[in-house]
């Protein structure tokens, strides 16, 4: 038998520095976790102790902190090279800055193969990108060879900015011929490495003949065998074993997100390349693991530019941006409108002629807006200002909800109105009217939503049975501020871009902003 150790990360999202336990900014260093310096220590320790080790990343290194805002992917290439990753799969966020924003900083600079079998380039891009990413790569490991095939969420055109010259095919359809090709090359140990979410990972394990192991990402799935070491609740055992349609046992793994854990999977192959055992667990990268001094020094060197960036002007406001709790928790506030407009603008994707955009709606808990911005400072808006407004380091995500769920959410928004609670919703692409004289749970008297399947957007009454796309903070998607109905009833959830980054990009694009209070949220006569 031959043993392989697979070390894996996914959805690191720009967490190059150590973070707090909840993956936000590190405050108390003695209790911080993750970061590339600490990751390197653990990886090196395992490389020294074990003979056949692969370090793999399942995508979404891009997007998530000021590191990505400033360095735009150069930081990913630099530090992944330093850690000597063996392969990476493309995630949807790798396309956030367009194809150019992937090619120049990452594809051209990475010293490791970057993979995706289901992305096909066409037109002028085909020759430009040729060879910069691959469908698969055969890697020598010890005396053996291991094939790695990549895959990426076919939803990427709705989640990012890959442009019109990349076609995202069905993962299973695209993977099978590549795996077959590897088999004809006498490669009998094959890992599918990709970024389509846990459900698709399991489907690949079930349906793609010849795949021995699936290493996934996108859904931030935490798997663990035994008592979990931190706050994450396991979605299943690690590894998660799927029986394939042809009767093989295929381990499927993922390692949560944000570099908090290092996935650690030991696979035993027999002489024919069959997986005869697998075991392991994600390793919590807590402060008991020291940060590697040379990587840490490099991080500190790269950090300098970030501190300078924080105080640079992004754009100007010529109006007071009212982010006060007295406004945003009680009524429509122009800071809420600004943020929602930025959220929609960040999700403009013209992927279908029938739709002016795939999503038109935004909801945002008023309690998530933590500060106003005064225009009397020469109108200047900096990253630092925005970090005060949105200090939690969240993301603005895309969900699919039924109209009935949205109606429940808006009832929850005002179920205890008047107590300055955070659940009062700010909106975009929505007109809501509340009657506070009615009993809680029955206060929404009008709820109109902006059409998407239209050439001239207009507001139509919400339909209870229709499925709508909505942009909202990850906090709400996870049921925060009591929005349990969103968490319980959402039909799809894709994590999006860093909240501050979304707003800063919008302000930089607009140059001068002047958001108004314009009647998105109204109260019917006599009740307010």
């Amino acid at each position: 038998a031959w043993e392989l150790t697979i070390l894996h990360t996914n959805d690191v999202h720009s967490r190059l520095e150590q973070t707090s336990e909840d993956s936000s900014k590190c405050v108390n260093a003695s209790r911080c976790m993750g970061g590339v310096a600490r990751l390197f220590t653990k990886v090196q320790q395992i490389r020294r102790a074990e003979p056949n080790v692969l370090l793999l990343d399942a995508g979404d290194q891009y997007q998530g902190t000021i590191w990505f805002t400033v360095y735009k992917g150069a930081e990913v290439a630099h530090f992944m090279n330093a850690l000597r990753y063996d392969a990476m799969a493309l995630g949807n966020h790798e396309f956030d800055n367009g194809v150019e924003g992937l090619i120049e900083p990452l594809l051209k600079e990475a010293k490791f193969p970057i993979l995706s079998a289901n992305i096909k380039a066409k037109g002028p891009l085909a020759s430009q990108i040729s060879g910069l990413y691959l469908p698969y790569k055969v890697l020598p490991v010890g005396d053996e060879v291991v094939g790695i095939v990549g895959y990426t969420s076919k939803e990427t055109p709705f989640l990012s900015n890959p442009g019109t010259n990349l076609v995202f095919e069905d993962e299973i359809t695209a993977l099978q011929p590549e795996v077959d090709k590897l088999k004809t090359l006498n490669v009998n140990k094959i890992i599918a490495l990709g970024h389509s979410g846990f459900e698709m990972d399991k489907l690949i394990a079930q349906k793609v003949r010849g795949v021995d192991v699936v290493v996934g990402g996108h859904s931030n799935t935490f798997l663990y065998t035994g008592n979990p070491p931190s706050k994450e609740v396991p979605a299943g055992k690690y590894p998660f074993i799927v029986t394939s349609d042809d009767g093989r046992k295929v381990p499927v793994v993922q390692a949560y997100a944000f570099g908090k854990y290092l996935g650690y999977l030991k696979i035993e192959f027999d002489e024919r390349g069959n997986v005869i055992s697998s075991h392991g667990n994600p390793i919590l990268l807590n402060s008991s693991i020291p940060e590697d001094p040379s990587i840490k020094a490099d991080i500190n060197k790269w950090r300098i530019k970030l501190d300078n960036y924080s105080t640079q002007e992004l754009g100007k406001t010529i109006v007071y941006l009212d982010g006060s709790s007295q406004s945003c928790r009680f009524r429509e506030c122009n800071m809420g409108n600004l943020i929602c407009d930025a959220m929609i603008n960040n999700n403009l994707r013209h992927t279908d002629e029938m739709f002016w955009n795939h999503v038109s709606m935004c909801i945002l808990n008023g309690g998530g807006i933590r500060s106003p911005i005064d225009e009397r400072n020469n109108g200047t808006i900096t990253w630092e200002n925005l970090a005060a407004v949105l200090p939690f380091g969240g993301t603005f995500d895309l969900v699919q909800l039924k109209g009935s769920t949205l109606k429940k959410a808006f009832e929850h928004s005002v179920h205890r109105y008047g107590q300055s609670t955070g659940e009062f919703l700010q909106v975009g692409g929505i007109h809501v009217v509340y009657d506070l004289s009615r009993k809680p749970g029955d206060r929404v008297v009008k709820l109109d939503v902006l059409c998407t399947k239209c050439r001239v957007p207009s507001y139509d009454p919400l339909k209870m049975d229709e499925v709508y796309k909505v942009i909202l903070p990850n906090f709400l998607a996870n049921g925060g501020d009591g929005f349990q109905m969103i968490k319980d009833e959402l039909l799809r959830h894709d994590s999006g871009d860093q909240d501050i980054n979304v707003v800063s990009t919008y302000i930089s694009k607009m140059k001068v902003i002047y958001p108004a209070v314009e009647g998105r949220i109204k109260f019917s006569t006599g009740s307010h």
């Epitope: 042809d246 046992k249 024919r272 005869i276």
Partner: antibody, heavy 118, light 107 residues
């Protein structure tokens, strides 16, 4: 410890249907596959199919497709196998079994004898 | 479907004997073979999978070997509780198939 407890013996007439249950305990029901196996008196074992209660992924042996239906009730931690249009050759002991990572039929129920007789 | 053929169909032996049961697959099944023990009126019990991996709690006197199409189950020193019927099974591809069984009786 892992236990699979099957329903009691059944006597059915040809053309009727029978539903055999398999109640699981001692582990998380949704984490493992349940397999069904047929054994006619003095004959070899035959694999009927599997169900994965976690996402209700079901696979049948082509030979048993059509007349057998596998289901699972997560809340009751119970798997079921229904056989319809019974005939005399369906007289057999039916077993449910659970896998264990790299072992397929690792833990077995005690078996349910189904007798088809007019 | 892959056919699994066991030999012998029955076998008489004494306590302390070394016994070998063979199983032949109709096509290459790599090392994907399991062995089960069944006593009258009872459910089968898994002994070995992946040709030579003993299941939890199975005594070390049971061992397996082989590759491709030819496999053997060996009981190094028969104990009274080992008299039963033994089945091989291929888990190389669906449909999973079993051998016809080898009945091990007391001489």
């Amino acid at each position: 410890q892992v236990q699979l407890v099957q329903s009691g013996a059944e006597v059915k007439k040809p053309g009727a249907s029978v539903k055999v249950s398999c109640k699981a305990s001692g582990y998380t029901f949704t984490n493992y596959y349940i397999y069904w196996v047929k054994q006619r008196p003095g004959q070899r074992l035959e694999w009927i199919g599997w169900i994965y209660p976690g996402n209700l992924n079901i696979k049948y042996n082509e030979k048993f497709k059509g007349r057998s239906t596998l289901t699972a009730d997560k809340s009751a931690s119970t798997a079921y196998m229904e056989l319809s249009s019974l005939r005399s050759e369906d007289t057999a002991v039916y077993y449910c079994a659970r896998d264990d990572n790299y072992a397929w039929f690792a833990y077995w129920g005690q078996g349910t004898l189904v007798t088809v007789s007019s | 479907d892959i056919q699994m053929t066991q030999s012998p169909s029955s076998l008489s032996a004494s306590v302390g004997d070394r016994v070998t049961i063979t199983c032949k697959a109709s096509q290459d099944v790599s090392t994907a073979v399991a062995w089960y023990q069944q006593k009258p009126g009872k459910a089968p019990k898994l002994l070995i999978y992946w040709t030579n991996t003993r299941h939890t709690g199975v005594p070390s006197r049971f061992s397996g070997s082989g590759s491709g199409t030819d496999f053997t189950l060996t009981i190094s020193s028969l104990q009274p509780e080992d008299f039963a019927t033994y089945y091989c099974q291929q888990h190389y591809s669906t449909p999973f198939t079993f051998g016809q069984g080898t009945k091990l009786e007391i001489k």
